[in-house]
């Protein structure tokens, strides 16, 4: 859909990973003066939400409150702007935003090889494992928008595991992992306990780096 206006932006506050029963704000905004914003969840016929746009300093926006979070609220969202109502003249869609519900199943374990403290430039691998038969593991880094996803390997010693090679360490961070099942890509487990990875002998040991995106800028198209 091309739209009569360029696409608005869609952000999740505080982020796109939402604990069960908690609320997330999806903010649709644009520098086009839209009078109306619509929020649509992919594949849903009934649940398109409509809000009147607010205008401040050349920006129009609408804050859609989604929650308390349940399985049927998770999914891929897009927002649209319109300067008219009945009929709407919709803009191009925002980039898609995957909203994930977490806290549904038992937490996996997260560990680091060779260990959570590594020398700068040394390779580090994070391993996520669980006795639950998760098909997929997701690794998130605090303050970063993009999760990484790996398929769980075959059962070994009673656990299902995925390894995330981080490559040569440059600066540390706090990591968490989640498990999910193939048939429910938007429904994730409880978070693992956080794992702090520290890099020693590195001048830029501060984290996150100033160029990294914040957790509210949306997340990638990788759930399907």
């Amino acid at each position: 859909h091309e739209g009569v206006h360029r696409k608005p932006s869609l952000l999740a506050h505080p982020g796109p990973l939402v604990k069960s029963e908690e609320t997330v704000i999806l903010q649709c905004w644009s520098d086009v003066r839209f009078q109306h914003f619509l929020l649509h969840r992919e594949g849903k016929f009934k649940d398109t939400l409509h809000l009147i746009g607010e205008h401040h300093d050349g920006v129009s926006k609408a804050n859609f409150s989604i929650g308390p979070m349940m399985q049927d609220l998770a999914g891929t969202y897009r927002c649209y702007g319109s300067v008219t109502h009945s009929p709407y003249q919709l803009s191009a869609p925002s980039d898609p935003l995957d909203i994930v519900i977490t806290g549904l199943y038992e937490k996996p374990s997260l560990s680091a090889q060779p260990g959570p403290t590594v020398l700068a430039g040394e390779s580090v691998t994070l391993s996520c494992s669980s006795r639950s038969s998760y098909d997929m593991y997701h690794l998130s880094r605090e303050g970063e928008a993009h999760e990484r996803r790996f398929s769980a390997g075959p059962k070994v010693n009673g656990t299902f595991q995925a390894d995330f090679p981080l490559g040569p360490a440059t600066h540390g961070g706090t990591y968490r992992c989640f498990g999910s099942f193939r048939d429910s890509p938007y429904e994730w487990s409880n978070s693992s306990d956080p794992l702090l990875v520290s890099v020693t002998g590195n001048p830029s040991n501060s984290w996150p780096s100033p160029t990294e995106p914040s957790s509210e800028t949306g997340n990638p198209r990788h759930l399907h």
């Epitope: 859909h1 619509l38 649509h40 992919e42 849903k44 016929f45 398109t48 409509h50």
Partner: antibody, heavy 120, light 111 residues
Framework: EVQLVQSGAEVKKPGSSVKVSCKAS????????ISWVRQAPGQGLEWMGG????????NYAQKFQGRVTITADESTSTAYMELSSLRSEDTAVYYC?????????????WGRGTLVTVSS | QSVLTQPPSASGTPGQRVTISCSGS????????VNWYRQLPGTAPKLLIY???QRPSGVPDRFSGSKSGTSASLAISGLQSEDEADYYC???????????FGGGTKVTVLA
Amino acid sequence: EVQLVQSGAEVKKPGSSVKVSCKASGGTFSSYAISWVRQAPGQGLEWMGGIIPIFGTANYAQKFQGRVTITADESTSTAYMELSSLRSEDTAVYYCARGELDTAIRFDYWGRGTLVTVSS
Amino acid sequence: QSVLTQPPSASGTPGQRVTISCSGSSSNIGSNTVNWYRQLPGTAPKLLIYSNNQRPSGVPDRFSGSKSGTSASLAISGLQSEDEADYYCAAWDDSLNGVVFGGGTKVTVLA
């Protein structure tokens, strides 16, 4: 003025398929939701499913899942409902109805209906 | 068997008030708004009440809707002969993921 113009009456054999069209005028077709509702002779209304052309989203009532296909052609402002594996119980008047994007299930305009008769 | 339950018929004399009930469950009326449609013989249905109690423009204020819990009702006051029609309630059902209708109520205006 909004109008939903439906295709003409059809007589079909059991086991065959029927495709009913609904051409919209007087509005931005793609920015609305189109539903299909049927009514068997002397019976009540039954929602079959709907489509929002701009979102490419089609939803089907569980009863018709796998047997009905709802599509839309934005270039001609026309929605279609195809029902397969017809049986005598599918003899009914088939209506298309329009809703706003954010009130997709509030049917504010209706077509006049298309009578589909299934008979051997 | 319709998901929403309506009485099959209702009647009254001109000028009277007639009320039609529509009973559902927590997955439809209990958690979603109710719309009412009126169907004159041989014609397509027409929206009469939306969002429980709102009238589209052109619908006289003799028609009113209400909702409480898992039930809704439509009231017609000052009944007129042209009100003879079938009346249907409808709501979204979260469990069925679709629109459900009542079986319809035939309103007769007695001479």
